[in-house]
Each structure stands twice: as C-alpha cells, then as structure tokens.
Interface confidence: low
C-alpha cells in the first residue's frame, strides 16, 4: 500500500490522543531502556509502512499483536485516513483470524512494541538522521 496519500495530521492526532497511551499500557512494567531501537523510518509514509508491518504481520515469537487495542486503533486510523487502505487489507484480516486467540505477551512482543513506539515517535518527528 502507498501511504503517501494519507492524512498525516489526522493520523498523528489519533496517535497522540489514544494509540500512544495504549502502547504505554502494553509496555507497562518494562523499562524504557530495556530494548534498543533497531527499526527506523525516513519520512511519514515510510514510517506508516514500517508501523503497519510490525503491527499486523505476525513474526516469529510474536503472533498476537493485531488483536491488541493499539493495533485495532491503528487499523481504524489507517482505514479512515488513508484512501483505499481498507481494500488492501482483506488478506491481512484473514491472517489476523488465524492468529492465536489468546493474548500472550512474550518478550519478543514487548520488543516489537518498543520498536513500534520508536516508529510512532519518528512519525511525529519525521526525517531520518542517517540512512
């Protein structure tokens, strides 16, 4: 999906008002220095590409993020403020249904959400400082 046509300011507002708080809730009890940020992005469309990938694509050791509150709100924000985004997500929805039903917070998931927090922060302060 090409995120260049999204309404970035509206997505930023959704992040600041709710998504950021849900990410903090998910990470509660984890030291902010526990994980190093290894994923970055160079501008807002690129950040959204990385955010979508980390939030909705199951990874080894963390298959359940798509059911979390921050993920559902992220999906809603992208669906509302990115033209045509919903149509591209039919396959992703099928993958979500196949994800395990119980919410299991593994260390790998915590690390992934820590990366997401960094990506969202970068989304709000775009421009990668080095490529």
């Amino acid at each position: 999906y090409d995120f260049t046509n999204c309404d970035f300011e509206k997505i930023k507002a959704a992040y600041l008002s709710t998504i950021s708080k849900d990410l903090i809730t998910y990470m509660s009890g984890t030291k902010s220095t526990e994980f190093n940020n290894t994923v970055s992005c160079s501008n807002r469309p690129h950040c959204l590409t990385e955010i979508q990938s980390l939030t909705f694509n199951p990874t080894a050791g963390c298959a359940s993020l798509a059911k979390e509150m921050f993920a559902m709100k992220t999906k809603a924000a992208l669906a509302i403020w990115c033209p045509g985004y919903s149509e591209t997500q039919i396959n992703a929805t099928q993958a979500m249904k196949k994800a395990r039903k119980s919410k299991v917070t593994t260390n790998k998931c915590l690390e992934q959400v820590s990366q997401l927090q960094g990506l969202w922060r970068r989304f709000n302060r775009p421009l990668l400082k080095q490529q």
Partner: antibody, heavy 117, light 107 residues
C-alpha cells in the same frame, strides 16, 4: 504567512569566518527541520545539511563537516549557518529551506556569499 | 549515496507545447521524489512531492509520475512563465541529493 528571511549578501576575505542567518516566521519554528542548500553560480543545487530546531541535532554531509556549523536560536526563531575558512569554492548562493518529510515547501530568498581578496 | 540523473540538461520548446523531464535514481527511492522550478535569481519553488502530489497553488498542467526508479515531470501546454530551470530531488533519507537540473528555454 510562512516566511524565511535570510541575511543580505556578504563579501568576505579568504579565511575569514562568516555567519548567515535565516529568520522564520508564520509557523512553529521547532516543528519543522531547517535545511541548507548551496548553489554555485550557473550550477545546480547541493544539499549541505539540516538541523532539528527542537533539540539542535544536526546532520551534515561529509564534505561540509569541517566547513559548516549549523545552529538555531529558538527565542528568535532563527537558524544560522557559519562557514569557516572560506575559499573561492565557497562563493555561492546559500538557501535555507524548511521541511517535514524531506521536500522543501518554503525557501529563503538566498544569501549571496562572495569570497575575494 | 543515492545519485539522481536528470535529463535532458537543456530543452527548447514553444508556448503551447508539451514537455517531459526525467530523473533516474541509482537505487529504489519508492515515491520519495520532489520537483522544483527555479527562475533566474530566485529561490526554487516546490512543484511536486511524493513523485506525483501537486504542491499547493501549482497549475494542473504540471504532473509527476513514477515507474520503478524513473520519475517524470510533464508540463502540458507550456506557458511563458514555465520557462526556467527544473530540479528533481529525492527525499528518501540522508543525504538528500538533487538532479543536475534541466534548463527549459523558449524556442
């Protein structure tokens, strides 16, 4: 309305340090990055570097690392570029330009620097 | 660093004609490319960003497109005010680089 007002033309002797200013108005200074671009007479555009006014973090391309120093004064919403030990190669028009996503929606009017003995 | 190769370096055309300027990136920069117009003695002005999004106030005769690593700026029905220099610039990540420029002159 958004404006980037640069300092006037400067004539400097080789080796004498020079400082160019870029005063921003009409928007939140710390929200946007400030970039600097060089254009030699009759030539194309060359990216020098950028500064984040919110925390003064700077990035300069290798060839300008020992030449340019970027600073900001948040209280006056002004960005500065200082060029050390200028030579004739530094004679050019220097532009400041603001950006969020890497493209420049507003530019300063340019500052002409002439290095001559 | 990403290199931007712009062509042609110069171009002569008449008012009313359609012209296309191209820019090729040395690697994949997705849609992260901007186009600027610069008149003699003036600052560059943003025309297009994200390869195909028209900047505010830019006439609809300007359009941007992308195919892989090749980007194009098309100007339909040239107007007298369209003559000047045009530059592409990638905005994918540091260091930002510009194409060498295209000088568009009146035939």
């Amino acid at each position: 309305q958004v404006q980037l007002q640069q300092s006037g033309p400067q004539l400097v002797r080789p080796g004498a340090s020079v400082k160019i200013s870029c005063k921003a108005s009409g928007y939140s200074f710390t929200t946007y990055w400030m970039h600097w671009v060089k254009q030699r007479p009759g030539q194309g555009l060359e990216w020098i570097g950028m500064i984040d006014p919110s925390d003064s973090e700077t990035t300069l391309i290798q060839k300008f690392k020992d030449k340019a120093t970027l600073t900001v004064d948040k209280s006056s919403s002004t960005a500065y570029m200082q060029l050390s030990s200028p030579t004739s190669e530094d004679s050019a028009v220097y532009y400041c330009a603001r950006t969020l996503d890497g493209y420049y929606d507003y530019w300063g009017q340019g500052t002409t620097l002439t290095v001559s003995s | 660093d990403i290199q931007m190769t712009q062509s042609p370096a110069s171009l002569s055309a008449s008012v009313g004609e359609t012209v296309t300027i191209t820019c090729r990136a040395s690697e994949n920069i997705y849609s992260y490319l901007a186009w600027y117009q610069q008149k003699q003695g003036k600052s560059p002005q943003l025309l297009v960003y994200f390869a195909k999004t028209l900047a505010e106030g830019v006439p609809s005769r300007f359009s941007g497109s992308v195919s892989g690593t090749q980007f194009s700026l098309k100007i339909n029905s040239l107007q007298p005010e369209d003559f000047g220099s045009y530059y592409c610039q990638h905005h994918y990540g540091t260091p930002w680089t510009f194409g060498g420029g295209t000088k568009l002159e009146i035939k």
